[in-house]
Interface confidence: medium
């Protein structure tokens, strides 16, 4: 299925609020009323689709230098070109230990290609420890463990997702570097398909073992908002999703995999310029709590609940949601205190369903694991009410949206 015209339409703004944050030397109002940004001179920094549009103040000289935003799961700091720290965040891969650097030849010679890479450490993404990621030529890393066809839709780390074609030039390479504490992917001298005359782009994404994510931009030869999204989505930011299984109406004994994007951060593309950088620092999540007491007493922005049978703390909105539902955790947690669980054997329960979505033996039409293997060709058509990848752009941790059904 080749990309359809208009397949990458820009998502519209969310239902915004200005989150806590400061611009150096300037205070920001802690919160705006939903859907309302009052000051006309505010410029949009990013969208946090777990909470809406985030606004930022501009400095008197109109040059944004450092901007901080709170996105529930991450705090982002944007460093402008004049900010020394933006240079410090750039990892000089050329100076790294040669044995830790790999030029990925498949990715470096190909258009619209992806390749799986194993990290040397567990990287916490939205609180989930990941060991395997998928690097794509189009300026992003797919963070999902289940491969599906609409790769650009969700579960990504995207310093600059766009229609890059490393195969255009021998100078274009996709390089990665792993020293055990940081994993860096660098898209080096890559050209936009059809826009080669604009020049080459060089940028990188760094995944730190503590969960920090850094986007660093060395060469951005054109205004990012001008990049066409007609052949490929254009996005900068983070996204995660969970997968759930629903009974298929057509085949009662089978279940249909659907993916829900529960959180997304979109940076304002106009802020992506040469020598700028963005740093995402992870905020605590329910998943980090290992005991009922710690879970129930946490003062996170999330509504954490303890599931005794799974021995897990969760808001119910993470990649383990299927298990959370299968084991009746939402019901179990209602109105109960930690003392109520102490006499119970947490090994005795079994899920409401005998199907485990985490088996290596998912029955699919090929050896790759795809979302929604029961769907037809028609199910892959883009949702006209959604963003470019067919995903709704208004899902939030508190809002259940329409799932995206992605066929094999």
């Amino acid at each position: 299925l080749s990309p359809q015209p208009g397949a990458g339409h820009d998502e519209g703004p969310g239902s915004g609020w200005a989150a806590k944050g400061t611009v150096r030397g300037w205070n920001r109002r802690a919160r705006e009323s939903p859907g309302h940004v009052s000051e006309p001179d505010r410029t949009q920094l990013s969208q946090d689709l777990g909470g809406g549009t985030l606004a930022m103040d501009t400095l008197p000289d109109n040059r944004t230098r450092v901007v901080e935003d709170n996105h529930s799961y991450y705090v982002s700091r944007l460093y402008g070109p004049s900010e020394p720290h933006s240079r410090e965040l750039w990892v000089d891969v050329a100076e790294a230990n040669r044995s830790q650097v790999k030029i990925h030849t498949i990715l470096s010679n190909t258009h619209r290609q992806a390749s799986r890479v194993v990290l040397s450490f567990d990287f916490p993404f939205y609180g989930h420890p990941l060991r395997q990621i998928t690097i794509a030529t189009g300026g992003f890393i797919f963070m999902g463990d289940v491969i599906h066809r609409m790769l650009t839709a969700t579960q990504y780390v995207a310093p600059l997702m766009a229609n890059f074609n490393p195969g255009y030039s021998d100078n274009s390479t996709v390089v990665y570097f792993d020293n055990g504490t940081v994993f860096v992917v660098q898209w080096d001298h890559v050209y936009l398909q059809g826009w080669e005359d604009k020049g080459s782009f060089t940028f990188q994404a760094a995944l730190h073992h503590d969960g920090r994510i850094v986007f660093a931009y060395k060469e951005i030869p054109m205004s990012v908002p001008e990049i066409s999204s007609s052949q490929h989505p254009v996005k900068t930011g983070l996204s995660d999703a969970f997968m759930i299984l629903n009974p298929s109406p057509d085949v009662p004994e089978s279940r249909r995999r659907s993916i829900f994007e529960y959180h997304r951060i979109e940076l304002d593309p106009s802020k992506v310029t040469s020598m700028s950088a963005v740093e995402f620092t992870p905020l605590p999540t329910c998943l980090q709590h290992r005991s009922c007491d710690a879970c129930m007493s946490s003062d996170l922005t999330f509504n954490c609940s303890w599931c005794h049978v799974l021995q897990r703390c969760s808001s119910g909105f993470d990649r383990y949601r299927q298990e959370w539902m299968d084991y009746g955790c939402a019901q179990e947690a209602e109105g109960r205190m930690c003392e109520d669980f102490q006499d119970e054997d947490h090994d005795s329960a079994s899920p409401d369903t005998s199907f485990s979505p985490y088996d290596g033996d998912l029955t699919t039409t090929s050896s790759s694991l795809f979302i929604d293997s029961l769907t037809t060709e028609d199910d892959t058509k883009l949702n006209p009410y959604a963003g470019g990848d067919g995903l709704q752009n208004n899902l939030s941790p508190k809002t259940k949206g329409t799932p995206v059904h992605l066929g094999t």
């Epitope: 992806a114 390749s115 794509a136 066809r149 090929s366 790759s368």
Partner: antibody, heavy 125, light 107 residues
Framework: EVQLLESGGGLVQPGGSLRLSCAAS????????MSWVRQAPGKGLEWVSI????????YYADSVKGRFTISRDNSKNTLYLQMNSLRAEDTAVYYC??????????????????WGQGTLVTVSS | EIVMTQSPATLSVSPGERATLSCRAS??????LAWYQQKPGQAPRLLIY???TRATGIPARFSGSGSGTEFTLTISSLQSEDFAVYYC?????????FGQGTKVEIK
């Protein structure tokens, strides 16, 4: 039924040409990268060439580069291998194989998850 | 090119016994490794992909492990239909390369 069926093999003299075909059925052909893999008599498997789902990307083993051309016709659900300047060492059973990929925007070249039954190419004078 | 080396070349095992096949890559291939089974006169058949994930329809007695440069295919209890040649293959880098094969024969 999901299957691949090769044809076009036979006896050819060194320096000659041959065109292999592989007819696919039972799956959406254009969504998958396809490949040719060969096996010389009594020997192991050797990857020959690969083509992406749209046909936009092709790759070759060094041993056949410049002599073999892989192509596909998605409207006919058919994969081809044009073999020119054949040598004795090209003698083998040629398998067409589907690459487990994901498509739409991207290809992820993974394992060969579906194979044809093979067609024998003999290069001899 | 990444060279894949399998050992042993031949493995003699009795039915019901456990078989362990090894595959070593000359440089890291991450988890981008597959195992195939081939019987005489037949095309290869995919058993394992991504180093450890069983392909559709493959019995649970087949399991794969490893990452980086060292990989193992284990057949927990050999059945008569498992006697065949087994190949590993990396798909981490061009050119795609196979090991030379391990023949599992009846002891």
């Amino acid at each position: 039924e999901v299957q691949l069926l090769e044809s076009g093999g036979g006896l050819v003299q060194p320096g000659g040409s041959l065109r292999l075909s592989c007819a696919a059925s039972g799956f959406t052909f254009s969504r998958y990268a396809m490949s040719w893999v060969r096996q010389a008599p009594g020997k192991g498997l050797e990857w020959v060439s690969i083509i992406s789902g749209t046909g936009g990307n092709t790759y070759y083993a060094d041993s056949v580069k410049g002599r073999f051309t892989i192509s596909r016709d998605n409207s006919k659900n058919t994969l081809y291998l044009q073999m020119n300047s054949l040598r004795a060492e090209d003698t083998a059973v040629y398998y067409c194989a589907r690459i487990d990929t994901f498509a739409y925007y991207y290809s992820l070249y993974r394992a060969f998850d579906l194979w044809g039954q093979g067609t024998l190419v003999t290069v001899s004078s | 090119e990444i060279v894949m080396t399998q050992s042993p070349a031949t493995l003699s095992v009795s039915p019901g016994e456990r078989a362990t096949l090894s595959c070593r890559a000359s440089q890291s291939v991450g988890g981008n490794l597959a195992w195939y089974q081939q019987k005489p006169g037949q095309a290869p058949r995919l058993l394992i992909y991504d180093a450890s994930t069983r392909a559709t329809g493959i019995p649970a007695r087949f399991s794969g492990s490893g990452s980086g440069t060292e990989f193992t295919l284990t057949i927990s209890s050999l059945q008569s239909e498992d006697f065949a040649v087994y190949y590993c293959q990396q798909y981490n880098d061009w050119p795609l390369t196979f090991g030379q094969g391990t023949k599992v024969e009846i002891k």
